[in-house]
Interface confidence: medium
């Protein structure tokens, strides 16, 4: 049976948590950290300081779930960027998505005000 | 004076209603609609299929200002984009970020229980 | 529940040296880093390092290199800070703190050792 | 080393009074600041961090804002076990570094 996505997010929380002073143990490594806290728009950078951290990070152990969890993370999020082009539809549905979109901008993004 | 993104966003959402007969015009068209309700990983083909029914749509009047703001807003997030792996910091600062992200997946993204 | 319990007051002379012990227990002692912070008599608090229970990896106020050191006994879940050399001015009382888990605040302080340097 | 400079160094209020502390810091610390609460003979206590986090457990009259270098703790309605000396912290970069403190004194 597959675990839901909502499942392995959590748990990877747990795990961060858990295995934070090992993932420190290198203090003089550097890594990208945005600049602002609309983090979706940083999928690409947060997966990226992740192989690095992952490169970096004496393994084995119950460490490995961690990763594990976050390489299904990153499947997942792959996966749904597949389905953003995957229909055509009426203009209407369009600007219902658009709409939807700019909703969610105006209520979670960070902004300024 | 620069307008606030939010104030842009909100005026544009506005400007959406009021402009959808004109919007809506064309019934053949047929644009991207990504079939799940996490919008933050589609903006590539959300702002592809605005330049589609841009080309498509009679221009002139108020619809220009829809079309500029979408334009504002496009710029915002390339700008916002280009500070995702503007700054190297400390791995504690980095898994910060990476717990955050997560933290909001977990409560704001549309996934499968 | 998580607990750090330091060791007693101590009285110590000038040039000699302190160790002080901070026993941790109620979660997994090496997932955080110790940190100590010291109090001057009516005086405000002053960082001096921590310690990274997982790899012994400890990082110091520079004002205090050299004459501090930090170690943790994995076996019973115990963070020293030793400090040399003392002086009069070290006079104070020391206290461990825990790093939390997310976003590095300390969330749990020991109670404190008073240390005096007196000749 | 970033410098942590509190205002006021000390305050007199009433049981009720909305207190206001502010810190700033000598450079920008990306909001890795905490307000630590510290009673006379007792070990110190963290009441929020990242600026505006509250910690668990601690009462919502307790509230932080601020980033970059300017940061502010309030207690909307001052109780009588508020009475302590409050110490902003930054932990952006080492060494951590404290403010010099705020007393918070009964009129």
């Known amino acids: 049976m597959e675990i839901p996505m909502s499942t392995v997010v959590k748990e990877t929380l747990i795990q961060l948590s858990t295995h934070r002073a090992l993932l420190t143990s290198n203090e003089t490594m550097r890594l990208p950290v945005p600049t602002h806290k609309n983090h979706q728009l940083c999928i690409g950078e947060i997966f990226q300081g992740l192989d690095i951290l992952k490169n970096q990070t004496v393994r084995g152990g119950t460490v490995e779930i961690l990763f594990q969890n976050l390489s299904l993370i990153k499947k997942y999020i792959d996966g749904q960027k597949e389905k953003c082009g995957e229909e055509r539809r009426k203009t209407r549905h369009f600007l219902d998505y658009l709409q939807e979109f700019l909703g969610v901008m105006s209520t979670e993004w960070a902004m300024e005000v | 004076m620069e307008i606030p993104m939010s104030t842009v966003v909100k005026e544009t959402l506005i400007q959406l209603s009021t402009h959808r007969a004109l919007l809506t015009s064309n019934e053949t068209m047929r644009l991207p609609v990504p079939t799940h309700k996490n919008h933050q990983l589609c903006i590539g083909e959300i702002f592809q299929g605005l330049d589609i029914l841009k080309n498509q749509t009679v221009r002139g009047g108020t619809v220009e200002i829809l079309f500029q703001n979408l334009s504002l807003i496009k710029k915002y997030i390339d700008g916002q984009k280009e500070k995702c792996g503007e700054e190297r910091r400390k791995t504690r600062h980095f898994l910060d970020y990476l717990q955050e992200f997560l933290g909001v997946m977990s409560t704001e993204w549309a996934m499968e229980v | 529940q998580v607990q750090l319990v330091q060791s007693g007051a101590e009285v110590k002379k000038p040039g000699a040296s302190v160790k002080v012990s901070c026993k941790a227990s109620?979660?997994?002692?090496?997932?955080?880093?110790i940190n100590w912070v010291r109090q001057a008599p009516g005086q405000g608090l002053e960082w001096i390092g921590y310690i990274n229970p997982y790899n012994d990896y400890s990082r110091y106020n520079q004002k205090f290199k050299g004459r501090a050191t930090l170690t943790v006994d994995k076996s019973t879940s115990t963070a020293y800070m030793e400090l040399s050399s003392l002086r009069s001015e070290d006079t104070a009382v020391y206290y461990c703190?825990?790093?939390?888990?997310?976003?590095?605040?300390?969330?749990?302080w020991g109670q404190g050792t008073l240390v005096t340097v007196s000749s | 080393d970033i410098q942590m400079t509190q205002s006021p160094s000390s305050l007199s209020a009433s049981v009720g009074d909305r207190v206001t502390i502010t810190c700033k810091a000598s450079q920008d610390i990306n909001s890795y600041l905490s307000w630590i609460q510290q009673k006379p003979g007792k070990a110190p206590k963290t009441l929020i961090h990242?600026?505006?986090r509250l910690i668990d457990g601690v009462p919502s009259r307790f509230s932080g804002s601020g980033s970059g270098q300017d940061f502010t703790l309030t207690i909307s309605s001052l109780q009588p076990e508020d009475f302590a000396t409050y110490y902003c912290?930054?932990?952006?970069?080492?060494?951590?570094?404290f403010g010099q403190g705020t007393k918070v004194e009964i009129k």
């Open positions: 703190a825990r790093d939390y888990g997310n976003f590095w605040y300390f969330d749990v």
């Open positions: 990242r600026a505006d």
């Open positions: 109620g979660y997994t002692f090496t997932n955080h880093h």
């Open positions: 912290l930054q932990y952006d970069d080492f060494p951590y570094t």
